[in-house]
């Protein structure tokens, strides 16, 4: 004979666990149904009645099968230096990521808590390491024979043009000036730009500021309490 399928709530066999999308209720001492994502437990089970679920209210969510009595609150609206990459729905939290030209100075479980503008390298300095979504630009002094005459978060140090006859020698912040009408270059003319970081979800690593860079605002804010994890939400 096939084994009888137990309907929730039911008492599990000694030593066994409840099935997928069920939880063991310690008070009722029964296996009871979990609520689906987008819902929460309105009434916990008893020995004879199963869990009663209800939809999450506006601006709240549950992402997993759960038996929490209250849905989690969606994060606050994205700030002006952020873009909303995932909207708040009944089944998922809002995710805010930094807009182009900014990086995440303080990350959270998903998205970014605090964005900061990417450091700009001043004339005489070029980008040594480009900014990413979670790390700032690193600047370095232009080596002899190279220069940068811009204040930029993307420009690297470029080689001085090679003159037949030098009118003004180049330095770290200025290209060489030639007297001849047809200078030669070791690289193609024009500024070399590094691409802006593409927004992807990744863990934040604290950048180490270089001493020889343009001033960058330092952010030191306390971490607020993270939203409570949904209790026993794993399937």
């Amino acid at each position: 004979l096939p084994a009888q399928v137990a309907f929730t709530p039911y008492a599990p066999e000694p030593g066994s666990t409840c099935r997928l999308r069920e939880y063991y209720d310690q008070t009722a001492q029964m296996c009871c149904s979990k609520c689906s994502p987008g819902q929460h437990a309105k009434v916990f089970c008893t020995k004879t009645s199963d869990t009663v679920c209800d939809s999450c209210e506006d601006s709240t969510y549950t992402q997993l099968w759960n038996w929490v009595p209250e849905c989690l609150s969606c994060g606050s609206r994205c700030s002006s230096d952020q873009v909303e990459t995932q909207a708040c729905t009944r089944e998922q939290n809002r995710i805010c990521t930094c807009r182009p030209g900014w990086y995440c100075a303080l990350s959270k479980q998903e998205g970014c808590r605090l964005c900061a503008p990417l450091r700009k390298c001043r004339p005489g300095f070029g980008v040594a390491r480009p900014g990413t979504e979670t790390s700032d630009v690193v600047c370095k002094p232009c080596a002899p024979g190279t220069f940068s005459n811009t204040t930029s978060s993307t420009d690297i140090c470029r080689p001085h043009q090679i003159c037949n006859v030098v009118a003004i020698p180049g330095n770290a912040s200025m290209d060489a000036v030639c007297t001849s009408t047809s200078p030669t270059r070791s690289m193609a003319p024009g500024a070399v730009h590094l691409p802006q970081p593409v927004s992807t979800r990744s863990q934040h690593t604290q950048p180490t500021p270089e001493p020889s860079t343009a001033p960058s605002t330092s952010f030191l804010l306390p971490m607020g309490p993270s939203p409570p994890a949904e209790g026993s939400t794993g399937d």
Epitope: Q26, K42, V43, F44, K47, P69, P228
Partner: antibody, heavy 119, light 106 residues
Framework: QVTLKESGPALVKPTQTLTLTCTFS??????????VGWIRQPPGKALEWLAH???????FYNPSLKSQLTISKDTSKNQVVLTMTNMDPVDTATYYC???????????WGQGTTVTVSS | DVQMTQSPSSLSASVGDRVTITCKAS??????IAWYQQKPGKAPKLLIH???TLQPGIPSRFSGSGSGRDYTFTISSLQPEDIATYYC????????FGGGTKVEIK
Amino acid sequence: QVTLKESGPALVKPTQTLTLTCTFSGFSLSTSGMGVGWIRQPPGKALEWLAHIWWDDDKFYNPSLKSQLTISKDTSKNQVVLTMTNMDPVDTATYYCARITGTRYFDYWGQGTTVTVSS
Amino acid sequence: DVQMTQSPSSLSASVGDRVTITCKASQDINKFIAWYQQKPGKAPKLLIHYTSTLQPGIPSRFSGSGSGRDYTFTISSLQPEDIATYYCLQYGNLWTFGGGTKVEIK
């Protein structure tokens, strides 16, 4: 508006049975998720949960007092009755009834009734 | 049975002080903890449920936090009307109250 009120004898003798009634209004025990429980508080001491009953007649008792307690309900009268057998002077306390929500915490309480156990 | 150890059993603080009460459960109670205020001769009054959810009409100076076995109740700025005894209640596995904390004004 939710209200609960306890009634019963103020004095019982040792070994006797105590019967307490909780009469409530503002909610119904025929509504899913509703329950009524009993809590007591000896003079100058902490609160102690005794028992409660759910809308579907499921009952829970404090394991250390289970043999003494019986809880029942009369849905039509909006009443819950608690009986406690073999009363002892240590059972002298203020007895409260309280509504319990579907997610299991007590939200509304009665004013309490004082029961003294003495010969 | 789940035991709830509440501390301190009594405390004396000045008006405006921050007051903190803790409850430790003998096992994980999944955030199923409520906090009650009881004044002499009165029934307990629900302040907070599910660790941190404030009941409607309860002043925001009352707050709760915690997870697993450890829970905290805080009055951010003690007021004269807060003089009472406070109890925690775990409802993750049957129901157990803490021993209470009597709060007095210095």
